[in-house]
């Protein structure tokens, strides 16, 4: 017989709770872990069950993105018995068990943190052996990356009527401030954030036209730090050369 | 493209077998609970068997236990139904079906496959 | 083993109606219901999971809530595309077990 809980509450401490007369489950996660790009973060997750000294198989999941459903990140799986909890995945091979699932933790350590890890997490434990249980945090921890401004992708593009563009793309968290100097702009230019489309980290400003030859630069600043890069654009017979 | 896709279904007289195969592609397959639903002409859906990431543990139905044999062979993302003992009411649609979850249960089937027709007859 | 019940075992609307079909389990199950539409000669698709998860790329219309015995699976306004068959399954504990069906047929 396969019996399963599953949590049904939750407070402003993402304490997770299912409770019923001599059993309950539940899971403590914070809400949100914050940590810096290329550092380690932990998410903590303890939990309590209704099977009192449990022995048997175990396995902790890490997912990401949403519960249930979204992809593993982290999974390992102890024996009968064991504390060891042997890793079955950890992807990119930057994820750790901090905690001993034995003993009701099911904490994470997550190493050399970029933008794209910026996502909620979720754990979850199941028992199977004599018992068979799985619960899982519905609501998870939001990981929060900063990260100082880099600049991804500057460059001169040809425009209608022989004319020329600069394109400029930074990431960072906070989203970064882009500006622009160069000749005929003045000491700089700033121009309007435009975060694109599913890259929530990233943010383009273009110079629309280039009236002059000479270096153009792009300066990227949050409240991390600042970062900057050039295009010099020199037109021979209608072309244009460009470097960084 | 993620799929599952069954073979192995066919015409066979009580007592006889039949083995089912569910070839699985793009997802990692060894990371999921897969499962065997049936569906008996102009009838509902029937939970058949369950296996669990690794084959450590299986699960049956008490109309086919001791009869199927659930197994995996996660080196070739495959998954089978050995069938023994047919009955007539064993007549059906065998679909394979990936678990939404994990490993080891099925929080729900979230991926299946078209699905493979056993007539059991004389 | 838990007993899966559904109703109506069929309905009849039309499009731009607003469906409820429940499913009533013979004990608790907690929030581990899905429900799955099944057209003929096709496989079932997942819907809603975990009772009240709507399964990527299935339409904002359809939407699931319930926990315990009594679930409720919900369309908004139903479309030509909606008359099908649906199932609601527990994976509470096994042997999982389906509901008998709901036949959504056009008035």
């Known amino acids: 017989f396969v019996r399963t809980k599953i949590d049904t509450t939750e407070n402003l401490l993402n304490t997770e709770v299912h409770s019923s007369p001599a059993q309950r489950w539940s899971m403590q996660v914070p809400p949100e872990v914050s940590a810096e790009a290329g550092d380690a973060a932990v998410l903590p997750c303890t939990f309590t069950h209704p099977h009192r000294h449990y022995d048997g198989p175990l396995t902790a999941i890490w997912r990401a993105g949403e519960p249930y459903a979204g992809p593993q990140v982290f999974r390992c799986a102890a024996a009968r018995g064991s504390e060891l909890c042997q890793t079955a995945l950890s992807l990119h091979g930057r994820f750790r068990l901090l905690g001993n699932p034995r003993r009701n933790d099911l904490s994470l350590r997550v190493e050399r943190l970029a933008l794209a890890d910026d996502r909620r997490y979720f754990c979850r434990v199941e028992f199977a052996g004599d018992v068979h249980d799985r619960y899982e945090s519905r609501h998870g921890v939001r990981l929060h990356v900063t990260a100082a401004p880099r600049i991804v992708n500057i460059s001169v593009l040809p425009s209608p009527a022989h004319a020329f563009r600069a394109l400029c793309t930074a990431e960072g968290e906070p989203p970064p401030a882009l500006a622009w100097s160069g000749p005929a702009l003045g000491n700089s230019l700033a121009a309007v954030r435009s975060p694109r489309e599913g890259h929530g980290h990233l943010v383009t400003a273009e110079l629309p036209a280039l009236t002059h030859d000479g270096r153009y630069t792009c300066t990227a600043a949050n409240s991390l730090g600042r970062s900057e890069a050039s295009v010099y654009l020199f037109r021979f017979h209608g072309a244009s050369g460009a470097s960084t | 493209e993620v799929q599952l896709l069954e073979s192995g279904g066919g015409l066979v007289q009580p007592g006889g077998s039949l083995r089912l195969s569910c070839a699985a592609s793009g997802f990692t397959f060894s990371s999921y609970a897969m499962s065997w639903v049936r569906q008996a002409p102009g009838k509902g859906l029937e939970w058949v068997s369950t296996?669990?990431?690794?084959?450590?543990?299986?699960y049956y139905a008490d109309s086919v236990k001791g009869r199927f044999t659930i197994s995996r062979d996660n080196s070739k993302n495959t998954l089978y139904l050995q069938m023994n003992s047919l009955r007539a009411e064993d007549t059906a649609v065998y679909y394979c079906?990936?678990?939404?979850?994990?490993?080891?249960?099925?929080?729900?089937?979230?991926?299946w496959g078209q699905g493979t027709m056993v007539t059991v007859s004389s | 083993d838990i007993q899966m019940t559904q109703s109506p075992s069929s309905v009849s609307a039309s499009v731009g109606d607003r469906v409820t079909i429940t499913c009533r389990a013979s004990q608790d199950i907690s929030s581990w219901l899905a429900w799955y539409q099944q057209k003929p000669g096709k496989a079932p698709k997942l819907l809603i999971y975990v009772a009240s998860s709507l399964q990527s790329g299935v339409p904002s219309r359809f939407s699931g809530s319930g926990s315990g015995t009594d679930f409720t699976l919900t369309i908004s306004s139903l479309q030509p595309e909606d008359f099908a068959t649906y199932y609601c399954q527990q994976s509470y504990s096994i042997p999982y077990t389906f509901g008998q069906g709901t036949k959504l047929e056009i008035k």
């Open positions: 296996i669990t990431g690794g084959g450590e543990s299986t």
């Open positions: 079906a990936k678990a939404i979850g994990s490993s080891w249960y099925s929080d729900a089937f979230d991926l």
